[in-house]
């Protein structure tokens, strides 16, 4: 049939939660394509009726939720004006109590699922909650060992876990617990994560390189809208935070009530020898008080900040 | 049940290059790090390097310009490489990793060794 | 780089004694691990993060330490115990291993 068939490494999953996989393949995906999904070679397509437990939600495949009896493969098949590609997908559904202290350890987790923490830093964990904008996710509560994770070493930021000055004590059972909504029906979705500890550098002490910003002003309207970029570079396996930060403290602590101010969601391309990352921050309305103030985007040990400030007034309007 | 299968020539001749490979089952190499360590004969043991989950490598520094690991993901295997041997070079190496009781830098998880003679 | 160092390099004990076996490192570790080694045999990780014993290693062992000074004992020596303990860290690279300290059972 003239399609080029990609093959994906298998991937593990719980059963009675959501999961959603997405039909990307750059750069075949860039341009304009169509993409359809199919189950175990079936002629029939996956339905894109919304209502239905499994349906395409424009590239992605989505379970509402994973049922044991979903593994098999999934095939995407991308079509371009001159190409098609076919992209396999085996999905393995397991049953997993996350409290069951019964179950010795986890079957072959997919790798996000197993993370590691680096003795005596700053480091964090993520919750990794891949699905498609039709999907609305609430705030994520974190556990270890089946408890809610308290404590001022902790953090929640945006889908991480902040933990300062990891201690050998932190290794073990971790889950991130969120409520993820669609069509109006509730479902939660909990990510178990086996943590690790180490006290390797992991990155080589190299320092992550702030690209963007430069220390530099921006000339802003009051009143306006502005979404500002911070775009670093950093090794691939690096351990470092990324965050915008004012007066010393996290943005989103900072304007915890107005929320006028906000950071975004991290992003990160894979190259070669190293990942772009880039961190937004949104001012939801630029007031007063913002000019003059330098609001710093910090990645390790690397830090740089922007500063607002008026536009000049145009005398020739005059 | 993690198990490193080791293989390789035993025997290299001066000025050639020493390449050992380990073979992982019961793991992924995507996950953790990769260790290589050699013992010298008397019972010396040095910490050669690693590779990583991501595929960073760390070199021991006394090594650094003659040595390369490496790895294939497809077929869950990471290698040694050393150029330029000589004698000095002769001792038993291992492949290893951690992440016993949730610590990576516990190196539960042993080859069998490859005793490798460098000699002409 | 941080030099470990183990001492005594070969100790002699008798079946039932109380041995202890140190390793002094050259600037602060946080942790210390230490490996076991018989002849013929692959190292076997004996002791990790100082103080954990990893499955299968006898209780009669026990390890100890901070900063600069480690050690591993053995509360009652067993015959089957004869081998090479090294230590080694992982806080600063170049990763270091000591320089073994031999254990025969007279």
């Known amino acids: 049939d003239g399609c080029n068939d990609i093959f994906m490494k298998n991937e593990m999953l719980s059963a009675s939660q959501p999961f959603a996989f997405n039909c990307t393949f750059p750069p075949i995906t860039s341009g304009e394509v169509s993409v359809t999904w199919y189950k175990n070679s079936s002629k029939i397509p996956v339905s894109k009726i919304i209502q239905s437990r499994i349906h395409q939600d424009e590239t992605w495949i989505l379970f509402l939720p994973m049922e044991w009896g979903d593994s098999g493969v999934y095939q995407c098949v991308i079509k371009g004006r001159d190409s098609c590609h076919r992209i396999h997908v085996n999905l393995t559904v397991f049953e997993k109590q996350w409290c069951d202290t019964s179950v010795k350890g986890l079957p072959n987790l997919s790798d996000e699922y197993k993370q590691i923490l680096h003795l005596g830093k700053d480091d964090s964990l993520t919750c990794h909650l891949h699905f498609p904008k039709s999907c609305i996710l609430g705030p994520i509560k974190w556990y270890k060992d089946c408890n809610e994770i308290t404590g001022e070493r902790f953090t929640v930021l945006e889908t991480r876990l902040l933990v300062s000055n990891v201690s050998a004590e932190d290794r073990g059972n971790y889950a991130c617990q969120v409520i993820l909504t669609h069509s109006g029906k509730q479902y939660e979705v909990l990510n178990g994560i086996t943590v690790s500890i180490t006290e390797r550098a992991g990155y080589g002490g190299s320092v992550p390189k702030i690209i963007y910003p430069k220390n530099n002003s921006i000339e802003v309207q009051l009143g306006t809208t502005l979404i500002v970029d911070c775009n670093i570079t950093d090794t691939k396996d690096n351990t470092n935070l990324r965050c915008w930060r004012v007066n010393n403290t996290l943005v989103d602590d900072y304007y915890n009530e107005s929320k006028r101010i906000r950071e975004g969601v991290e992003t990160h391309a894979s190259f070669r020898e190293y990942n772009l990352y880039t961190v937004n921050i949104t001012f939801l309305e630029v007031k007063m008080e913002d000019y003059g103030l330098p609001f710093m985007c910090h990645a390790g040990v690397s830090a740089a900040y922007i500063m607002l400030q008026l536009p000049a007034p145009d005398f020739r309007a005059y | 049940e993690v198990q490193l299968q080791q293989s390789g020539p035993s025997l290299v001749k001066p000025s050639q290059t020493l390449s050992l490979t380990c073979s992982v089952t019961g793991a992924s190499i995507t996950s953790g790090y990769w260790n290589w360590i050699r013992n010298f004969p008397g019972n010396k043991l040095e910490y050669m390097?690693?590779?990583?989950?991501?595929?960073?490598?760390y070199y021991n520094p006394s090594l650094k310009s003659r040595i390369s690991i490496t790895r294939d993901t497809s077929k869950n295997q990471y290698y040694l490489q050393l150029i330029s041997v000589t004698t000095e070079d002769t001792a038993t190496y291992y492949c290893a990793t951690g992440g016993y009781d949730y610590v990576e830098d516990a190196l539960y998880y042993w080859g069998q060794g490859t005793s490798v003679t460098v000699s002409s | 780089e941080i030099l470990l160092t183990q001492s005594p390099a070969i100790m002699s004990a008798t079946l039932g004694e109380k041995v202890t076996m140190s390793c002094r490192a050259s600037s602060n570790v946080r942790y210390m691990y230490w490996y076991q080694l018989k002849s013929g045999a692959s190292p076997k990780l004996w002791i990790y993060?100082?103080?954990n014993l990893a499955s299968g290693v006898p209780a009669r062992f026990s390890g100890s330490g901070s900063g600069t000074s480690y050690s591993l004992t053995i509360s009652s020596v067993e015959a089957e115990d004869a081998a090479t303990y090294f230590c080694?860290?992982?806080?600063?690279?170049?990763?270091?291993f000591g320089g073994g300290t031999k254990l025969e059972i007279k």
């Open positions: 080694q860290q992982f806080t600063t690279s170049p990763y270091t």
């Open positions: 390097g690693y590779i990583s989950y991501s595929g960073y490598t």
């Open positions: 993060l100082t103080s």
